[in-house]
């Protein structure tokens, strides 16, 4: 039979950050290769990563077509000898379906990890500091342009700013529905900042890791009386 001595894939895991989405699985192949298929709940299966010896497959191009859809993937284990006939012969020499394993369901909009944000700039004017968070580009497209994280998530995405005097450890916080903060500071004091992306309505993967810390007196800042 065409499926002898193949080992079904296992531990299928979605790895996704800011919609860059890769399916990973085990084991490393021995005398077999893998082909991945992906579909929405109501859609047709589409094959990707044909006859690969990798144990991962980048499915970003598929999921960004509609990030609010729920996707299912499956990984076929194909005997090495059957993988040389071209893409049209995914199935074994006698037409039987090779063993496969289903992934967990994955809804990008609800589950993709929020990437570590970056503080784009901060500017002090008197006792106010304007802090701007970089609006990172995603691989989601609309009208042939790549959308930013804010474009995709809209008001579902908020940012939390942590800020503190360089001379002390007591942190204050502010939140915003945009990518900007405007905070009160003490004149003559230097402050440090870190931001975190949050989607409060989520049940999983609600928060990003904190951005790198940026402090006044460094090159990203600007000071005006």
């Amino acid at each position: 039979s065409g499926t002898t001595n193949t080992v079904a894939a296992y531990n299928l895991t979605w790895k996704s950050t800011n919609f860059k989405t890769i399916l990973e699985w085990e084991p490393k192949p021995v005398n077999q290769v893998y082909t991945v298929q992906i579909s929405t709940k109501s859609g047709d299966w589409k094959s990707k990563c044909f006859y690969t010896t990798d144990t991962e497959c980048d499915l970003t191009d598929e999921i960004v077509k509609d990030v609010k859809q729920t996707y299912l993937a499956r990984v076929f284990s194909v005997p090495w000898r059957n993988s040389t006939h071209g893409k049209e012969t995914l199935f074994g020499t006698h037409g039987e379906e090779p063993p496969y394993e289903n992934s967990p369901e994955f809804t990008p909009y609800l589950e993709t990890n929020l990437g570590q944000p970056t503080i784009q700039s901060f500017e002090q004017v008197g006792t106010k500091v304007n802090v701007t968070v970089e609006d990172e580009r995603t691989l989601v497209r609309r009208n042939n342009t790549f959308l930013s994280l804010r474009d995709v998530f809209g008001k579902d995405l908020i940012y939390t700013l942590y800020y503190w005097k360089s001379s002390s450890s007591g942190k204050k916080t502010a939140k915003t529905n945009t990518n900007e903060f405007l905070i009160d500071v003490d004149k003559g004091e230097n402050y440090c900042f870190s931001v975190q992306a949050v989607i409060p309505s989520r049940t999983v993967n609600r928060k990003s890791t904190d951005s790198p810390v940026e402090c006044m007196g460094q090159e990203k800042g600007e000071f005006r009386e």
């Epitope: 008001k155 945009t178 903060f181």
Partner: antibody
Framework: QVQLQESGPGLVKPSQTLSLTCTVS?????????WSWIRQHPGKGLEWIGE???????RYNPSLKSRVTISVDTSKNQFSLKLSSVTAADTAVYYC??????????????????WGKGTTVTVSS | EIVLTQSPGTLSLSPGERATLSCRAS???????LAWYQQKPGQAPRLLIY???TRQTGIPDRFSGSGSGTDFTLTISRLEPEDFAVYYC?????????FGGGTKVEIK
Amino acid sequence: QVQLQESGPGLVKPSQTLSLTCTVSGGSISSGQYWSWIRQHPGKGLEWIGEIYYSGSTRYNPSLKSRVTISVDTSKNQFSLKLSSVTAADTAVYYCARDAPYYYGGGYYYYMDVWGKGTTVTVSS
Amino acid sequence: EIVLTQSPGTLSLSPGERATLSCRASESVDSSYLAWYQQKPGQAPRLLIYGASTRQTGIPDRFSGSGSGTDFTLTISRLEPEDFAVYYCQQAGVVPYTFGGGTKVEIK
């Protein structure tokens, strides 16, 4: 000075689709605000239908989500509402509104600060 | 959804009097997302207060907002003839955004 103007048929038959358009003048629809639809049943309070960002990102009221589509046309500076399978219960004044960011407590939050005059839609055969 | 209950339903007062309008939420609302609107007959609502306590530009200082958590208040310190209208509180922090049922301030 941003102004909003709703337009569309004032009478829709039951089971049909209600379609309204809101034209934005005096400002760009792509300038970082959100654009909302709200309705008010005769003699009643206000009900939020949903909102859209210029990028097409939407949020809908779950009670209407299965019937509502809000879309945006940046080239025409317009956004639209479609409500399918209407019944007499959808008879209301429909408002479009701008949701703009206002500074509060260190950050910026969105509030509906500019509204259209409203258009009355009656669902009747 | 968050239910906002306004009381009283109707407030009958004379010009010059103080009006106190209450808005109670079924669960805690972040003050950042709490707004008050005024609506007159045949007109669209008008934003008065945002962030529970900040007056929108051009709104007279006789209007003030306060409160946090589940209890919010709109106060009109001295009613002017043009203040007789319906007032709505609204939360825009949790989908669906919701409005209170409104308080009608009428001339006594």
